[in-house]
């Protein structure tokens, strides 16, 4: 049994290394930012579209949304790519949990407010279900202070 677990851990580790979790992180952060903008913005102050991260078309990150995505279109595009990545973990609930933990760790230092952190965790827990996948039963998303700096 230990041998099986060890193989399972190795398999999970290689799955995690292969996976590109950036679309998941981008999708979730856009949701947080969107809510922040609609909550904290003066409704009478017109503004640039807050729904997609700022991008210079000539210097785009391959995982970033087009600067021309409107009203969250970029976010649904990210969600689709995110779901494709999470699908790889469908048959291993423990590994799915580790993927979610990695997403949390990668973004935790971006979340400087309690509400933002709680909302991110909530959205993250719901992510597998949004993708039509089984969510891990128990998955601790707590991160040690400060989180991991991943730029």
């Amino acid at each position: 049994r230990q041998q099986w677990e060890l193989q399972g851990d190795r398999r999970c580790q290689s799955q995690l290394e292969r996976a590109n979790l950036r679309p998941c992180e981008q999708h979730l952060m856009q949701k947080i930012q969107r809510d922040e903008d609609s909550y904290g913005r003066d409704p009478y102050s017109p503004s640039q579209d807050p729904y997609s991260p700022s991008q210079d078309p000539d210097r785009r990150d391959p995982y970033s949304p087009s600067p021309y995505d409107r009203r969250g279109a970029g976010s649904s595009q990210h969600q689709e790519r995110c779901c494709n990545e999470l699908n790889e973990f469908e048959n291993n609930q423990r590994c799915m949990c580790e993927a979610l933990q990695q997403i949390m760790e990668n973004q935790s230092d971006r979340l400087q407010g309690r509400q933002q952190e709680q909302q991110f965790k909530r959205e993250l827990r719901n992510l597998p279900q949004q993708c039509g996948l089984r969510a891990p039963q128990r998955c601790d998303l707590e991160v040690e202070s400060g989180g991991r700096d991943r730029y």
């Epitope: 640039q48 971006r110 700096d149």
Partner: antibody, heavy 118, light 111 residues
């Protein structure tokens, strides 16, 4: 309305200590990271320190590391900056600043002036 | 540490005319989550700084739409489409990718 009121500044001799306070109101204080930012007379802005909403993470600029300590009392809606071994170059207006929860400094106090001189 | 460099350091402006301030960082401010951690602040004479733009292009609440932010990676720009007398002051860019660092400031004054 968000209000941040700093106090505790004054004239102090080099090597001595001073404790700054910031009284916050108009928002849920214990939900947000808070910062201290300073501005030397006629100079630009310099970020000094930050403390996470749950005090779980403290960050300092290299120029103050080991000398300054940031802390907060969520029950009192207060932010503090304990400044030890003060130097002439610490002379500045010290601002108490609220984070919007996503690393942006969205509200600033009026500042309290610290003058380090013999 | 990330170093922020603004140019010009002084900008004489004419009311009604456009103005532009550049900010460059010593390393990319584009996070893996797709956002550029670059904010713009204005400090009017005798006042505390106020937030203008967050995450490179998101205008803060109550900020007039003549202000706009753009750029990605290491190069960013703050544009004022038509300068008004009340826009004078010192403009600062600030990176929030790793801790927080400000540019030296750009003093905008009327010609």
């Amino acid at each position: 309305e968000v209000q941040l009121v700093e106090s505790g500044g004054g004239l102090v001799q080099p090597g001595r200590s001073l404790r700054l306070s910031c009284a916050a109101s108009g928002f849920t204080f214990d939900d947000y990271t808070m910062h201290w930012v300073r501005q030397a007379p006629g100079k630009g802005l310099e970020w000094v320190s930050s403390i996470r909403w749950n005090s779980g993470n403290l960050d300092y600029a290299d120029s103050v590391k080991g000398r300054f300590t940031i802390s907060r009392d969520n029950a009192r809606h207060s932010l503090y900056l304990q400044m030890n071994s003060l130097r002439a170059e610490d002379t500045a207006l010290y601002y108490c600043v609220k984070d919007n929860g996503l690393r942006t400094l969205d509200f600033w106090g009026q500042g309290t002036l610290v003058t380090v001189s013999s | 540490d990330i170093v922020m460099t603004q140019s010009p350091l002084s900008l004489p402006v004419t009311p009604g005319e456009p103005a532009s301030i550049s900010c460059r960082s010593s390393q990319s401010l584009l996070h893996r989550n797709g956002y550029n951690y670059l904010d713009w602040y204005l400090q009017k004479p005798g006042q505390s700084p106020q937030l203008l733009i967050s995450l490179a292009s998101n205008r803060a609440s109550g900020v007039p739409d003549r202000f706009s932010g753009s750029g990605s990676g290491t190069d960013f720009t703050l544009k004022i489409s038509r300068v008004e007398a009340e826009d004078v002051g010192v403009y600062y860019c600030m990176q929030a990718l790793q801790t927080w660092t400000f540019g030296q400031g750009t003093k905008v004054e009327l010609k």
